[in-house]
């Protein structure tokens, strides 16, 4: 397991919400990505391939997400000060082998200016 701080901009703010970017290597074909707040699983997304290379993407929780070829974005909305915390992207790589888990994260700071758009 590799632990570390994200070496990219992990938090993108817009309209009173935040997009949390969880990156993975382009070569990864099958994986599970979890968004952790402290030790709590907030969101998850699993990509697997079945027979005939059919791709299946599943989540256990209702949590807005978007998949690209090298990242999963999780979206949090209605930001308030309680959202300030450490957030971690917990990546489990199934394919290509060997199985590997990496954990990267950062602290989400909430400032008044980021809450402005919810007050319209």
């Amino acid at each position: 397991e590799i632990n570390g701080s994200a070496n990219y901009e992990m938090f993108i703010f817009h309209n009173g919400g935040v997009q949390i970017l969880c990156k993975y290597p382009d070569i990864v074909q099958q994986f599970k990505m979890q968004l952790l707040k402290g030790g709590q699983i907030l969101c998850d997304l699993t990509k697997t391939k079945g027979s005939g290379n059919t791709v299946s993407i599943k989540s256990l929780k209702f949590c807005h997400s978007q998949l690209s070829n090298n990242s999963v974005s999780f979206f949090l909305y209605n930001l308030d000060h309680s959202h300030a915390n450490y957030y971690f992207c917990n990546l489990s790589i199934f394919d290509p082998p060997p199985f590997k888990v990496t954990l990267t994260g950062g602290y989400l700071h909430i400032y008044e200016s980021q809450l402005c758009c919810q007050l319209k």
């Epitope: 817009h14 309209n15 009173g16 919400g17 969101c43 997304l45 059919t54 299946s56 993407i57 599943k58 989540s59 256990l60 929780k61 209702f62 949590c63 807005h64 997400s65 978007q66 998949l67 690209s68 979206f75 909305y77 209605n78 758009c117 919810q118 007050l119 319209k120």
Partner: antibody, heavy 124, light 107 residues
């Protein structure tokens, strides 16, 4: 071709129960979250309930909480809505709707396929 | 709950007209907005998601714009099959809510 077919609606007295079913075909049912949306006669649309692919997360609108139960049977490609303690204000056409994954968005409750609906009338 | 308010409630237009429908959210919803078309006796049809992305198979005369609280659905050149009721829906905050609908009628 994606097909959603609802059944189970009908005329029922206030306080009684009904169970709605939605049979899905034309897509891998257990890859998708599913929802119920209703429309009172001559009125707009109202989201009622949603369920993730494995029933791990379930949500209801406040007005049906504690009275309605959403469930699914992935082996049967079916979605259900158990409606108890029905009220006159529950009278509506009930649609089963598939959650969209357009644009590679997941778990975002917008709906790309809908059934034709099943009418529930609650009246004494 | 987030209230979605559409205007106008109805609009009379002719084939070939440009029609604009607006949807206002009671609080910011970023771009978490969809548009649907519903014809009498039929189920809603998914037109636009993420405020401005056109669903596959939907004609390019339909377009969406906006973010935050103010959104617009535009039909650039109204066709006979476009006479229907249009609904916006927010997907930002639970419970997911729809606008009251805008009926596009033949003038």
């Amino acid at each position: 071709e994606v097909l959603l077919v609802e059944s189970g609606g009908g005329l029922v007295q206030p306080g009684r129960s009904l169970r709605l079913s939605c049979e899905a075909s034309g897509f891998t049912f257990d890859d998708y979250a599913m929802h119920w949306v209703r429309q009172a006669p001559g009125k707009g649309l109202e989201w009622v309930s949603g369920i993730t692919w494995n029933s791990g997360s379930i949500d209801y609108t406040d007005s049906v909480k504690g009275r309605f139960t959403i469930s699914r049977d992935n082996a049967k490609n079916s979605l259900y809505l158990q409606m108890n303690s029905l009220r006159a204000e529950d009278t509506a056409l009930y649609y089963c709707a598939k959650e969209s994954t357009s644009g590679s968005y997941y778990n975002v409750p917008w709906f790309d396929y809908w059934g034709q609906g099943t009418l529930v009338t609650v009246s004494s | 709950d987030i209230q979605m308010t559409q205007s106008p409630s109805s609009v009379s237009a002719s084939v070939g007209d440009r029609v604009t429908i607006t949807c206002r959210a009671s609080q910011g919803i970023s771009s978490w907005l969809a548009w649907y078309q519903q014809k009498p006796g039929k189920a809603p049809k998914f037109l636009i998601y993420a405020a401005s992305s056109l669903q596959s198979g939907v004609p390019s005369r339909f377009s969406g714009s906006g973010s935050g609280t103010d959104f617009t659905l535009t039909i650039s050149s109204l066709q006979p099959e476009d006479f229907a009721t249009y609904y916006c829906q927010q997907a930002n905050s639970f419970p997911w809510t729809f606008g009251q609908g805008t009926k596009v009628e033949i003038k």
